[in-house]
């Protein structure tokens, strides 16, 4: 009876996500068979989040809307470890929007999910950000410095990275 009600709850939770994510990949968390964490297929997972590399080229605003439709946001990078995981799935000759912008052009950078912007946990390329007209952030590869962030014009289409919390069932 307990297992039955647990299964029913799981099924109803899965139905919530089915509209945007018809397929989920789930793994057992820890030793308890009752706790599963899932990411939409073919998203990748790291710690408590799921990530999707969008290869369609769109402006920053359209990229954020695209992530939002999938129940996600443009990626918020909180640690070096998280960035190191993300870059494994990126192409060196491409640039990808982050969920980081400065819409007022006053160098008040803000993350889409309202995570406080911490200057100590940023990975700007040297000399960046360098232009008050360029109000959105990308991550890209520079041969001299490997992967890092750069400010660019928000309306210039780029690839993007979406991030959402894992789905627990």
């Amino acid at each position: 009876n307990f297992m039955y009600s647990k299964t029913v709850k799981r099924l109803s939770k899965l139905r919530e996500y089915q509209q945007y994510h018809p397929s989920l990949t789930c793994v057992m968390e820890g030793k308890d068979i009752e706790d599963w964490s899932c990411c939409p297929t073919p998203w990748t997972s790291f710690q408590s989040s799921c990530y999707f590399i969008s290869t369609g080229m769109q402006s920053w605003t359209k990229s954020q809307k695209n992530c939002s439709v999938m129940g996600a946001d443009l990626v918020v990078i909180n640690t070096r470890e998280e960035q190191d995981f993300i870059i494994q799935n990126l192409k060196r000759n491409s640039s990808y929007f982050l969920g980081l912008s400065d819409p007022g052009g006053r160098r008040h950078w803000q993350w889409v999910d309202q995570t406080p912007y911490n200057e100590n946990v940023t990975f700007w390329h040297s000399g960046e950000p360098n232009n008050l007209d360029e109000r959105c952030a990308i991550i890209n590869f520079r041969s001299s410095e490997e992967w890092g962030w750069n400010d660019i014009h928000c309306h210039v289409p780029q690839k993007s990275i979406c991030k959402m919390k894992k789905i627990y069932i």
């Epitope: 769109q58 402006s59 605003t61 809307k65 819409p103 008050l132 007209d133 309306h155």
Partner: antibody, heavy 121, light 111 residues
Framework: EVQLLESGGGLVQPGGSLRLSCAAS????????MSWVRQAPGKGLEWVST????????YYPDSVKGRFTISRDNSKNTLYLQMNSLRAEDTAVYYC??????????????WGQGTTVTVSS | DIVMTQSPDSLAVSLGERATINCKAS??????????VNWYQQKPGQPPKLLIY???NLESGIPDRFSGSGSGTDFTLTISSLQAEDVAVYYC?????????FGGGTKVEIK
């Protein structure tokens, strides 16, 4: 007072090249993103190119990508447009304009008087 | 690309009367409460001049008989009381995503 003065237009044969210049004054040119916009005879406006203040980021629509190159010399307060492999459909008045950001978008707030490019055999 | 469709192509209005120009975007050009549509005026033999930015913000130095409204995909430029000096072609433009695109223009004349 902001002033933008385009020059370098003229008559050129299909397949030929031309370099347009835009001399800027009345503002701190080196801090402004700049754009070129063109207007074919009796037609509407078409964005041609944009370059950021430092000159390290340039953008083009597909219609001119690979043929046109935007550049700038901040020491001379001058914007350039190098146009190669010109076609009849490139015939237009070419305007340079200053770019002003507006949140995630932008406006073209000051425009020059334009220079005329005619591509014909 | 985002297509901007203006209507009508031309408009004849009596002096002192209201002129209304419409612009429709092929997809939404809004984000976070702002609309990325600008309006320009071009008089014969002159370059375009910025009138309205962000759909409804009046550019400095532009008379307040000009106003802009709309959001999402539908936008309007209104001249509340047409003056002789307003005879021109008016263009809408989106700056939400490259390539920036302009409407085909609306020619405003005196009836």
């Amino acid at each position: 007072e902001v002033q933008l003065l385009e020059s370098g237009g003229g008559l050129v044969q299909p397949g030929g090249s031309l370099r347009l210049s835009c001399a800027a004054s009345g503002f701190t040119f080196s801090t402004y993103t700049m754009s070129w916009v063109r207007q074919a005879p009796g037609k509407g406006l078409e964005w041609v190119s944009t370059i950021n203040s430092g000159g390290d980021n340039t953008y083009y629509p597909d219609s001119v990508k690979g043929r046109f190159t935007i550049s700038r010399d901040n020491s001379k307060n001058t914007l350039y447009l190098q146009m190669n492999s010109l076609r009849a459909e490139d015939t237009a008045v070419y305007y340079c304009a200053t770019y002003r950001p507006y949140y995630y978008g932008s406006v073209l707030d000051y425009w020059g008087q334009g220079t005329t490019v005619t591509v014909s055999s | 690309d985002i297509v901007m469709t203006q209507s009508p192509d031309s408009l004849a209005v009596s002096l002192g009367e209201r002129a209304t120009i419409n612009c429709k975007a092929s997809q939404s050009v809004d984000y976070d409460g702002n609309s990325y549509v600008n309006w320009y005026q071009q008089k014969p033999g002159q370059p375009p001049k910025l009138l309205i930015y962000g759909a409804s913000n009046l550019e400095s130095g532009i008379p307040d008989r000009f106003s802009g409204s709309g959001s999402g995909t539908d936008f309007t430029l209104t001249i509340s009381s047409l003056q002789a000096e307003d005879v021109a072609v008016y263009y809408c433009q989106q700056s939400d995503e490259d390539p920036w695109t302009f409407g085909g223009g609306t020619k405003v004349e005196i009836k």
